[in-house]
Amino acid sequence: MMTGTIETTGNISAEKGGSIILQCHLSSTTAQVTQVNWEQQDQLLAICNADLGWHISPSFKDRVAPGPGLGLTLQSLTVNDTGEYFCIYHTYPDGTYTGRIFLEVLESSVAEHGARFQIP
């Protein structure tokens, strides 16, 4: 039975050109994490394998950095980065757990519009 739960950083609104950290945490299970995949829509961004370490997809190499921990850092954000990101935890013996984070990247003109938020 899958007893674990995934906690995420929560959805993030950020400004174009900035950087943000996406993080997930798997709790309430003793299952062993064998691999964590980070995906956006149907694109694989990065893999963190328990034995082999990190692999960043070639098309994201210059803007995606591994960590902290099992998280992912996205740099030089563009409006095109707006979308849903998935952390997919492959575990044994439980199976797969998935967390969802939506990233909204705003043009500077929109970001300044009437808000009192911390803009990453």
Epitope: I21, Q41, E107, A115, F117
Partner: antibody
Framework: EVQLQQSGPELVKPGASMKISCKAS????????MNWVKQSHGKNLEWIGL????????SYNQKFKGKATFTVDKSSSTAYMELLSLTSEDSAVYYC??????????WGQGTTLTVSS | DVVVTQTPLSLPVSFGDQVSISCRSS???????????LSWYLHKPGQSPQLLIY???NRFSGVPDRFSGSGSGTDFTLKISTIKPEDLGMYYC?????????FGGGTKLEIK
Amino acid sequence: EVQLQQSGPELVKPGASMKISCKASGYSFTGYTMNWVKQSHGKNLEWIGLINPYNGGTSYNQKFKGKATFTVDKSSSTAYMELLSLTSEDSAVYYCARGLRFSLEYWGQGTTLTVSS
Amino acid sequence: DVVVTQTPLSLPVSFGDQVSISCRSSQSLANSYGNTYLSWYLHKPGQSPQLLIYGISNRFSGVPDRFSGSGSGTDFTLKISTIKPEDLGMYYCLQGTHQPWTFGGGTKLEIK
């Protein structure tokens, strides 16, 4: 002035599909997400999901995955939601709403869908 | 999914009253950057819902200052300082911090 103009009421038969349109004006269509919300029985509000008109990226409430499909036509600043395999449970008022910072700033006037044989 | 519980379900008022509506979430709505995506809406009969407050306490443009929002973490409040006839309707809170976004069940503000 920001405006979201939705298509008119629909009466459709069970098992059919239908598409609701939402034409945006008064702002840069690709700069904001477009969200869809269901209101059943004149009370309950449910977030169906959103689309990013800039790149067509979508995010669905899992409850509506396979039921709703979002698309956009950037040339006409119009967002669409197609509802599939309709049943009486899908009878409701559907709203499009412009999103910013995970709130719904401006709403369309709503489209009433009645599913009945 | 995050469960959002709104109280009361119904709120009978007289014009001029001050009222509070509560919204509680099943988990914290603060993201890792300290931003909390909790907003409030008024849905008047025959109209579309309208945004009143976003980010806990920021009044949306054109919203009168008799509306104010407060709270943190899992506990949030909408206050209306002096009820006017145009304030009657259904009030909803919405959390947008966690996927999927979820609404409270609504509070009906009606005349006593």
